[in-house]
Structures are given as C-alpha cells and as structure tokens.
C-alpha cells in the first residue's frame, strides 16, 4: 500500500508582496528553486482540510527491484510558490517529478482552485527518460494574464490509483483598480442630502477613492475603498464620478448625472379623439416629467359660452394612459379644455386650452303636460303637449313621435305617428271603439328620439255616447291613469 506523508510548511504572508518563495515577474525571470535549496513553500491551505499547511502528497512505493532496494518516495520537486505579475503579462510555471521507469502511463494534470483545467490551456508535459527514472516536467503558460487567472495551481499525478499532488503555485495578477460598485444616476429632491457609493478592488490593495463632482475633487485626501459620499444637497444638476487609485495607477468610474426633481412641464398636443352629446374623449402628450414620475392628471373644463358663469369643472384621473372621457357635459355646447399633470414635487402649468364641442343628442326629457281627448264628431283623438325645456332638448327639435296603443278584448295594436317640430298638438283617428287608447309622446332631434312621456289613457266608447272629458298626463305619483266616461 502507498502511504502518504505531509511536509510541514513555514508560514509566510501571502500578501501584499514578495516573500521567500514568491516571484514578482514584472522584472525578474521565472526561477525554479531546487529542492536542495532548503526553501519551504508558502503556507497554503488544502481544500480538503482547511487550516492545515499543505505541501503536496508524497507517494512511498512499496515495490522493490530485483536487488530488493526500496524505491525513493515519489514527490513533485519544490518550485516557486508565489508569482506576482501585472495584468496582460505572460507567465509560465512548471512542476517536475522523477518517476521510476517501472511505472507506465503516468499522466500529469493541472488544477486551479480545486478544479481540473481541461481543454484550451497551454499545458505541455515533457518526458526525459534515463536508465532508471524518467524526469517529467509539466509546464503551464498563460500568454496574457487576466484577473480571472488569479488562484492556486497544482499538479496531480496518478500512480497505481494513488494521487501525488504538488505544492501549490499561487498566481497573483495585479492591475489597475477594478470597480465592483460605481455611483448610480439618481433623481433627487432639491437641497436634500443623498448618498453615493463607490467600491473598487485590486490587487494590489489598498485601493483609495477620490470623489469628483463637476470636475472638482470633493475630498482633499483619498478614502479607503469602499467609500460612501454624502452629498449635502444640490440646487442644480451635477455630474459625479469616483477615481480609484492603487500602486498600479488610477481607474475612473463612469460619470453619473444627478438630476434635480422639479414640477413637470405642461402637457402638449391636447386633442379631441371623439365627441358625443354628453361626453368628449381627449388625449394628450405628457410634458417632461421633471425627473419624477407622474402621479395623476387634472382635466379642466370651462363652458366657452360668453354668457356662462365661467365656472370650471375639474376631473382627476391617473397619469396613464394619457386619455380621458369627460362626461356629464351638455349637448351641443362649446367647451375650453386644459390638462395639468402632477409629480411628487407639484402640479404642472395647464396645457394650452383647446376648444371642443359636444354633438346633438336625443332629448333628455319628454314633452310636458300631455293631454288627450276624444272628438266624437270627427271620430278623432286630439293630443296636446308642451315642448321640453330648451336646455334639455339636447339639440334642435325636428319633431315628435307619438305612440298610441289600442287595447280591446284581449287585442292590442300599437301605432306610431311622426309630427313636425312646429306643432304642439296632433290628431289621430280612432282605430277601435269600445277600447282603451294609451298615448305617449317623445321629442325628436337629429341626435335621436328622447324618452316617451308617461302614458295617458282614454277610453273610446261604442257609438252613441255623448259626454267626453279630456285625459291628461298625471300629476307626479299617479301612475297609469284611466279616464272612465
């Protein structure tokens, strides 16, 4: 069986810079320190046993040669433990081991931070056979190092199902500071303090931060990253950035604009999408929001009639979808309409006023004081009424529609008459004797037919009756009147 031995390592700080066994490659050629030098590698922690110094596994083979001499323990030779280099530079490092020739098919694999490196990496393994042993040198090269190449690299070799692991080679890629948090654009309330954050990392550390506002440095001396700037308030737009400095140089963050919230600009392009007798659908294009979201809008409606009392109707609505149906308007009327919108700061001015008109509508009330009486001499029913109030005609009267229903012995017949707008009386022929005639009248405009009046009933007797009184629209509260003669 193969046993495992572990060398103890002398701890050296891994950071910030060179130490025995580390290598700054910017100016120094790569060194391979021989095992005999007495060099002890840096303190590295085994991924499987955190906290324990680890310098690789040593396989002690139990196989003996013909002369029964035990073979020397197999271990990777010590090499450089720490390489420090700048971003975009090239680096090459290697592992070497001497393996007795009795072992066949030995392969070396490279691992970084516990994961095997496969595929498109520049790893080359060279074999130098001798009489009894073969020297194997595994080289790993990176042509242009990036921060992501930082880490701990090891070689592994499998022999007889046992693993031999090299000491780690720690690669530290240094470069300009790299931002992990940059200031963000904001919209702020005037004269109100707010915070901006900037964070950058190396290596090398430390990273120091300067804040810049409108091209002027805010802090005379740098602050260690991360840094929070409390801006005491602004009265006008400002541009902020932060500078991150380390020993390699300076990186400047993106510049961010901090805007001051203000009342919105007035809406523009208020337009009429649709008009009916009692409503107008309007739309508008919102003005600039003042760097603060719109909350709601107010539609102001004034009668354009110079004789009107000038009162303003106000309708509140949500800011979206920039559409509103104004209801409860009079038909055939002219209105001035303006729109104003608000954000958290306040209301915009009112948009330019536009003129809009409602269309004709069907009358909203029925003719009044409908009276009905029988004229036996001419065998007619005379009907009289009063036209609805002008305000409620909702347009120009073009006439009236008269509905008369004749009911007798289970038979019912409805007839409709149209009457010109000038009259306020009509005469209809008696259709059926010994029957009830029910009359209703509606006013008519181009906008349509209005509501019918309450029904007025009159009884039409058989021939020979003499005395007839008129029937009329009942007083409110009396439903369905019938005149019995």
């Amino acid at each position: 069986a193969i046993t495992e031995a572990r060398e103890e390592a002398k701890p050296y700080p891994l950071f910030p810079g060179p130490f025995p066994g580390s290598l700054q490659t910017d100016h120094t050629p790569l060194l391979s320190l021989p095992h005999a030098s007495g060099y002890q590698p840096a303190l590295m922690f085994s991924p499987t046993q955190p906290g324990r110094p680890h310098t690789g596994n040593v396989a002690i083979p139990q196989v003996t040669s013909v002369e029964s001499k035990p073979l020397p323990p197999l271990a990777f030779k010590h090499t450089v433990g720490h390489i420090i280099l700048s971003e975009h530079k090239g680096v090459k490092f290697n592992c070497s081991i001497s393996v007795p020739n009795i072992y066949q098919d030995t392969t070396i694999s490279w691992w970084k931070d516990g994961k095997e490196l496969l595929g498109a990496h520049h790893a080359i393994t060279q074999f130098y056979p001798d009489d009894e042993v073969t020297a194997i040198i595994a080289s790993f090269s990176i042509t242009s190092v990036q921060r992501s190449d930082n880490g701990s690299y090891i070689c592994k070799m499998k022999i007889n199902n046992e693993e031999i692991v090299s000491d780690p080679i720690y690669i530290e890629v240094q470069g300009l500071p790299h931002f992990t948090k940059q200031p963000e654009s904001m919209n702020v309330t005037r004269n109100t303090a707010f915070n901006l954050t900037c964070q950058a990392v190396g290596p090398p550390e430390p990273v120091n931060i300067f804040w810049v506002q409108n091209s002027s440095r805010v802090n005379e001396q740098p602050e260690k990253s991360p840094s929070v700037l409390t801006v005491p308030g602004l009265t006008e737009m400002a541009v902020f950035s932060c500078e991150a400095h380390n020993d390699k140089g300076l990186t400047v963050s993106k510049g961010v604009q901090i805007n001051i919230k203000a009342i919105p600009s007035p809406p523009t392009e208020v337009s009429i999408r649709n008009s009916t007798a009692h409503s107008i659908l309007i739309s508008w294009v919102p003005g600039f929001d003042g760097y603060s979201p719109f909350r709601n809008c107010s539609i102001q409606v004034k009668e354009a009639d110079p004789l009107s009392n000038g009162s303003v109707m106000i309708f509140n609505t949500s800011a979206l979808p920039h559409l509103y149906q104004i209801k409860q308007l009079q038909a055939l009327a002219n209105y001035s309409i303006g729109v104003s919108c608000m954000n958290e700061i306040g209301w915009s001015a009112v948009s330019p006023w536009i003129l809009a008109s409602t269309t004709e509508g069907a009358p909203s009330v029925a003719p009044l004081n409908v009276t009905v009486f029988l004229n036996e001499s001419s065998d007619n029913v005379d009907i009289r009424w009063m036209k609805p109030p002008t305000k409620q005609q909702d347009g120009e009267l073009v006439g009236y529609r008269i509905s008369h229903v004749w009911q007798s012995a289970g038979i019912s017949k409805e007839l409709l008459e149209e009457v010109g707008q000038n009259g306020s009386r009509a005469r209809i022929s008696v259709q059926v004797h010994n029957a009830t005639c029910t009359v209703r009248i509606a006013a008519v405009t181009r906008g349509g037919v209005g509501p019918f009046s309450d029904p007025v009933k009159i009884f039409i007797p058989a021939h020979g009756w003499v005395d007839y009184a008129p029937s009329s629209t009942p007083a409110p509260g009396n439903a369905d009147p019938v005149l019995i003669i």
């Epitope: 004269n191 804040w211 506002q213 409108n214 002027s216 805010v218 802090n219 005379e220 001396q221 740098p222 602050e223 700037l229 409390t230 005491p232 308030g233 009265t235 400002a238």
Partner: antibody
C-alpha cells in the same frame, strides 16, 4: 473630541524664520488634509493652501509660494507652517483648519499671532 | 481664481429684525460655506454647503442660493449674533473667502 492646538504667539524681526505648529487629536490625522489660513489684523481670511497628511505633499495658493512651507510630523499628529525671510506684511494670525469634504473647515485651531517688527 | 464679494460690508440691525447678507461669486460655484468670527476668536463653522446649519447653530439662521448668488439670513436677530460672517466657495481651486459682512446690533 476633535481638537487642533496651535503653538503660542511669536515676535520676530524682518528676515528671520518662524515655524508654528498645529497638533491634532480626536481623529485619524492622516485621513484629512490640513489647511492654513492667514488673517492680517482687521483684515479678511486668506486661504494659504493645504498639506496632504497621508503623502506629505503640500499645495500652496498663488500668494503663498516661495517663502512658505508646510510640513508634517505624522507620528506626533502635527502639522507645521514655516515662513522664511519674514516681512512686515507677514504680521497676522495664522490658523490651521482640518479639511473635509467640499473643503469644509469644520475644525479650526485657536490661531497663532506672528508679529514681525524691527 | 474666483472672487467672492460680500455685501453689505457692515450691517446694522435691531434685535428681532430680519437681516440678509449676500455673497456673490465671479463665476458659478457648487456650494457656499459660511463661518462666524467674533473678535479675538477663530472662525466657527456656521453653514455648510449653502443651506446646512453646523452643529449648535440656532435655527433662526438659514442659507440659500445657487450659481453665483448666495445669502445668509437671520430671521430674528439677537445680540449674540454680532460678529463678522465670511463666505467660502467650493467648486474651484484655490479655496477663497469673501471679504466678510460685519453685523452690528443696535
């Protein structure tokens, strides 16, 4: 609490040198710049410049280049103002002031009166 | 360099009066600081970054302004307010102070 304590008054002759000190306490000295402000008798405040307490690099206002020197003794949290080849017009009270964001001088020394007279 | 002009140079007021002093800059600046100085004393920080009262400053003081025009207002002057008030700009190097406004109480 934060304090800036300046050295006492000085009476000097023209051509001599004076070095006044400003000892800071109550905060990390090397985190904030130290500014120097001149006030001649009955006159306005004049910003002379500042010294970076971390790097030791001084910055002088245009009217204070040449004969004026800012320096530090970081281990003692002390900043110094030295004026060489003193002139009568150097007679003034000199204040040190702790720098902050937006060049806000939230803490001032009590002032050192330097009198230059033959 | 930016020149700060304070007016008036001397301001005389009775207790309870409202007073305003102004500081105009030769170019636009981001913030104006104000300091109060009484004879024989070092300046005291008074108003930070245009409108923020320093610790211990009474609420009757206020600051405002932007661009090239800034002001310090005392809503009801008290005897203890007698002092010289200096403005100092932030926004351009070198740092500069105004010539001061001396407030006298009648």
């Amino acid at each position: 609490q934060i304090q800036l304590v300046q050295s006492g008054p000085e009476l000097k002759k023209p051509g001599e040198t004076v070095k006044i000190s400003c000892k800071a306490s109550g905060y990390t000295f090397t985190n904030y710049g130290m500014n120097w402000v001149k006030q001649a008798p009955g006159k306005d405040l004049q910003w002379m410049g500042w010294i970076n307490t971390y790097t030791g690099e001084p910055t002088y206002a245009d009217d204070f280049t040449g004969r004026f020197a800012f320096s530090l003794e970081t281990s003692a949290s002390t900043a110094y103002l030295q004026i060489n080849n003193l002139k009568n017009e150097d007679t003034a009270t000199y204040f040190c002031a702790k720098g902050g964001h937006y060049a806000w001088f939230a803490y001032w020394g009590q002032g050192t009166l330097v009198t230059v007279s033959a | 360099q930016i020149v700060l002009s304070q007016s008036p140079a001397i301001l005389s007021a009775s207790p309870g009066e409202k007073v305003t002093m102004t500081c105009r800059s030769s170019s636009s600046v981001s913030y104006m600081h104000w300091y109060q100085q009484k004879p024989g004393s070092s300046p005291k920080p008074w108003i930070y970054a245009t409108s923020n009262l320093a610790s211990g400053v009474p609420g009757r003081f206020s600051g405002s302004g932007s661009g090239t025009s800034y002001s310090l207002t005392i809503s009801r002057v008290e005897a203890e307010d007698a002092a010289t008030y200096y403005c100092q700009q932030w926004g351009s190097n070198p740092r500069t102070f105004g010539g001061g406004t001396k407030l006298e109480i009648k």
